[in-house]
Structures are given as C-alpha cells and as structure tokens.
Amino acid sequence: KKVVLGKKGDTVELTCTASQKKSIQFHWKNSNQIKILGNQGSFLTKGPSKLNDRADSRRSLWDQGNFPLIIKNLKIEDSDTYICEVEDQKEEVQLLVFGLTANSDTHLLQGQSLTLTLESPPGSSPSVQCRSPRGKNIQGGKTLSVSQLELQDSGTWTCTVLQNQKKVEFKIDIVVLAFQKASSIVYKKEGEQVEFSFPLAFTVEKLTGSGELWWQAERASSSKSWITFDLKNKEVSVKRVTQDPKLQMGKKLPLHLTLPQALPQYAGSGNLTLALEAKTGKLHQEVNLVVMRATQLQKNLTCEVWGPTSPKLMLSLKLENKEAKVSKREKAVWVLNPEAGMWQCLLSDSGQVLLESNIKVLPTWSTPVQP
C-alpha cells in the first residue's frame, strides 16, 4: 500500500493510473467504501463523503489514463486509506495528515521556551526534527520543546516529520523579541555628552509597552531609577525622570537616551527593561558607563577612570610621541613633576585605545590648560 503524507491546510493529490491511456470509468472510495468521486463519461460525479466540497480531480489528465483525487484544505481526520477502482483493479493509498503548531504565540521573549506540537492521525508514530535558524536541532515525538530561545533563533524554523520512511516538511516563523545587544559599554571623558542607544532586534507593526532604566552608580550604595517611559505604537513618551542626572529621551525608536555630561558620579552600570503589552516577562539590556578624568594639581599629574572596567584594561600616562611614563592595570595613575608638554591619558585593551584624554602641562611657572 502506497503511503502519502500531507500537511494540515494544504492540498494533496493522490494518483491513480490505468494501463489504458484513455478516459475510462473510475471512482475513489474511502476505507468505509463510501464513494468520494468518480466519472460518468466526461463528467465529474461526487459521492456522499465528508470530503464532498473539498474533493476534486483533474479532468485534463483522464485522457492519459490518470485519475487523481485532489483533496483541498487537508484536515487531520482526512487521514484514511483511499481506494481507486479502475479497470477492475483497486489501488490503495494511505493518506496521513499532520499539523505542526507553536503552542504559544510565535513572538517570544529571549530566554523564553518554545513548544511545538505535532497533530497526527491515530495509530501513527511519527518522529519530528526541528531546526532553528542557527543550525541547532531538536528531535522528538509529538511535542518538542526548546527551553531558552536566543536572538539567533529568530527566523524560519524547518521541521521534518518522518513516518513510514516518508517525510513532510513544515516551516514556522518564530520572532524572538530582544534587544540587539545584551550589553554595551560607553567610554567618555569627563564633561562629554553621553548617548545610550537600545536598538531592538525585531520589527513589529505595533509596539506598545513601558520601560525603565535603573542605574547603579559605582559611588552609590544602591541603584536608582533614572527614567521611566511608555511606548505606544512605536512612539516614546517620558513618564518620570530624575533631576540629577536629567536624561533626555528620543521620541522615536530605537530607544535613545542622552546624558548631558559624563561625570564620575554617574559612572556605573544600568539596566534598561522593557515590558511589552500582552507579553509575560521583560526585555533587558545592560549598559555601562566608564568616565575618565585627567587633572594636574601642583606637581602631580593624575589620570583616573570610574565605572565597570575589566581587570585586563591598562591605564597609562604618556607625553605625546613618547613612551608611556606609567602604565598600570589600575583605575588611577599619576606622574610626579611632569615635564611640560601635551600629556595623554589612555585606557586600552590589548593595545586598542578605548578612551583618551589630553592635558597640557605648562612650564612650572604657569597653570595647566585642559584642551
């Protein structure tokens, strides 16, 4: 018996071929011997089966001795053995219809779990494999679960159902709701304007929710809420903002915050959370601010950084175009009795400069100038 796999909602064509290449009488029945369709001369006739309005054939093929049964908008319950009777012969075709659905919404937050459920006809024992856009596979029976979705799981998932050595493929589009970056770090000289950007990794027609930026300054004992905002159809409106610092927020996506001045007391790390309407859970992005200050007090030239720096980072002081006078894996370095000239304070990671501040040291009878 021939086995054909179908997909719920799709159309299937079951073939039936006569040895004579001409139009002769045929009819299709189900396993209960109820007639589905057949012909009377060149006319298509239909029986009293449940498929009545969804069954068809291709009259153009009858002259070639082909008498297909076409079933549209397949349902799981269409799974059955179909019998084609032609030239005193019976051709049996077993149709198995499967459906694959995501148990929840197909728009899921990063870190949430995805469950895919296979609808299958009674008596079948299919195996299923689903592949995420990043090439990861999950295999199982009627239910497949992935416990923690990543941003790169966004896109088209390809699921293959295997039954009786036959395969049928499903495509499911999954959108993982997340910020483009889990974490970012901004390096600024004292006094510079700071721009924080929080681009989303997905696009949806309507985006509504609310968000908040909590900030833990390095110098502070506890974190505080810097700003809260609403998002309505991609329009941003500020609800509440602290007086110090007075952040400004862009009115359109991507979420954009401006800190007028980078000051040591602001150095630290923040967590922006975004709660989306009709979604449980929140999107998170961590943001870090490192602030540098170079100063000269009497005979001491000092360079300091505040904020979350890795222990691998190197802080150095050097006279322009010369070797570093001092270079340490510390958050403050200094030079006593510095020579006159343009000094550079550099924060670097494996030779790559992350932040630079220049300070001009004048001969000892003058006062220093900061460019």
Epitope: S113, S127, Q129, G135, K136, N137, S147, E150, L162
Partner: antibody
Framework: QVQLVQSGAEVKKPGSSVKVSCKAS????????INWVRQAPGQGLEWMGT????????DYAQKFQGRVTITADESTSTAYMELSSLRSEDTAVYYC????????????????WGQGTLVTVSS | DIQMTQSPSSLSASVGDRVTITCRAS??????LNWYQQKPGKAPKLLIY???TLQSGVPSRFSGSGSGTDFTLTISSLQPEDFATYYC?????????FGQGTKVEIK
C-alpha cells in the same frame, strides 16, 4: 557500555577517496547526532560536519563542503564519513563523536568519542 | 563563523598548582561552551559542558565559568594525570568551532 568503534587506519593516494565507519553500540543510535572531527598531526581539533541518523539531515563545515559526505545506516547503527579528492593536507586522525539532545541546547556536547582513524595521504 | 581563541597556547605548571585557561568567542555564545581534555594518542574527553556543568565522572578539581564571550577553565590543584591539551568548543551555532588548544606541561 556506550561506545563508538571506528574502522582501521588507511593509506590513500592523492586524488582518491576514503570512507571511515563509526559503529555505535550501547545506546539508541537514532536518538543522537553523530559529528565528525579531524586532527592533523600536531594540530588542533577541526569540526567537519554532523548527521541526524533518523532523518539523514547533514551539516558540513564550509571548508569541506562538496568534498565530504556523511551518511548513516540505522539498520547497523553505523555512521560513515567519506572524504574525496584527497590531498596531503588531509592526513589526520578522524574522530566520530556523539552529540546528545535535550530541551536545553546548552547541554549539547560531544560526550562519547570514537578511538580515531588515522588517514595518511601519500603518493 | 564563530572564532574561538584560547590563551595561553601552552603553560608549564607543577603538581598542586592552580591552573587557569581562558577562551574567548568572537561573538556572544551565551553559555554554549564545552571543554575537552586530550592526551597524546587518545581521543578527546568531555570535561565540562554548558560553560560550568561538570561531566559525570570528571573530578571536582575541574571547574568552568563564564558567559557571553569570555570563559575560564580552572584546575584547582593540578594532578599528574592532568598534563594534557585542553580545548574549548562552542555549540551555539553550526558550524561548531574549537579553540586552538592549550598544552599544560610539567614545569
């Protein structure tokens, strides 16, 4: 016990092909992917590709695309790796390794390895 | 493809020493990071999966940490049988990639 047993060492001429087998025992062959990893003399590990035995679906590293074919025979619980158009740089130990499934993909790792098959390509 | 960079490429240590090997991914791989040990002429052996989970039967002196792009394998007190080459591997996305290896030698 759970093990992967590979075929013996091979000496091949440049331009020819080699087919290495990897027989699984002690577990359900179709429940795990089989990966192939190679190691040139004195070098590190290099991932070549993988197969899901029950579905026959494969993935290959770009470097080997078109030259490598990974297959699996459920009836004998054996995976195969065939490498064609051999050159001297393909002289290496070829390993098969089992990769498990769980709902947490974080747990995916090569927990069982074959003993390795030395393939020498020399004229 | 995701590049994995291990450091150092080799190190000399004595029995009883605390040894740390680092592995850096070219992009965030969450905690999809495995560590393997390989001895000369032998197949690699899984030590740690999912960045910090110890594989069954592996001594507790081995530990792993990290998430995102930076990972560490630590051997708290080096034993004679630990002299080997160690590899990190990302299982975040196909194609899977390995670090170049760190050879731990006797001082």
């Amino acid at each position: 016990q759970v093990q992967l047993v590979q075929s013996g060492a091979e000496v091949k001429k440049p331009g020819s092909s080699v087919k290495v087998s990897c027989k699984a025992s002690g577990y359900t062959f179709t429940s795990y992917d089989i990966n192939w990893v190679r190691q040139a003399p004195g070098q590190g590990l290099e991932w070549m590709g993988t197969i899901t035995p029950i579905f026959g679906t494969t993935d290959y590293a770009q470097k080997f695309q078109g030259r490598v074919t990974i297959t699996a025979d459920e009836s004998t619980s054996t995976a195969y790796m065939e490498l064609s158009s051999l050159r001297s740089e393909d002289t290496a130990v070829y390993y098969c390794a089992r990769e498990g499934y769980s709902s947490s993909w974080h747990d995916d790792a090569f927990d069982i390895w074959g003993q390795g098959t030395l393939v020498t390509v020399s004229s | 493809d995701i590049q994995m960079t291990q450091s150092p490429s080799s190190l000399s240590a004595s029995v009883g020493d605390r040894v740390t090997i680092t592995c850096r991914a070219s992009q965030s791989i969450s905690s999809y990071l495995n560590w393997y040990q390989q001895k000369p002429g032998k197949a690699p052996k899984l030590l740690i999966y999912a960045a910090s989970t110890l594989q069954s039967g592996v001594p507790s002196r081995f530990s792993g940490s990290g998430s995102g792009t930076d990972f560490t394998l630590t051997i708290s007190s080096l034993q004679p049988e630990d002299f080997a080459t160690y590899y990190c591997q990302q299982s975040y996305s196909i194609p899977y990639t390995f670090g170049q290896g760190t050879k731990v030698e006797i001082k």
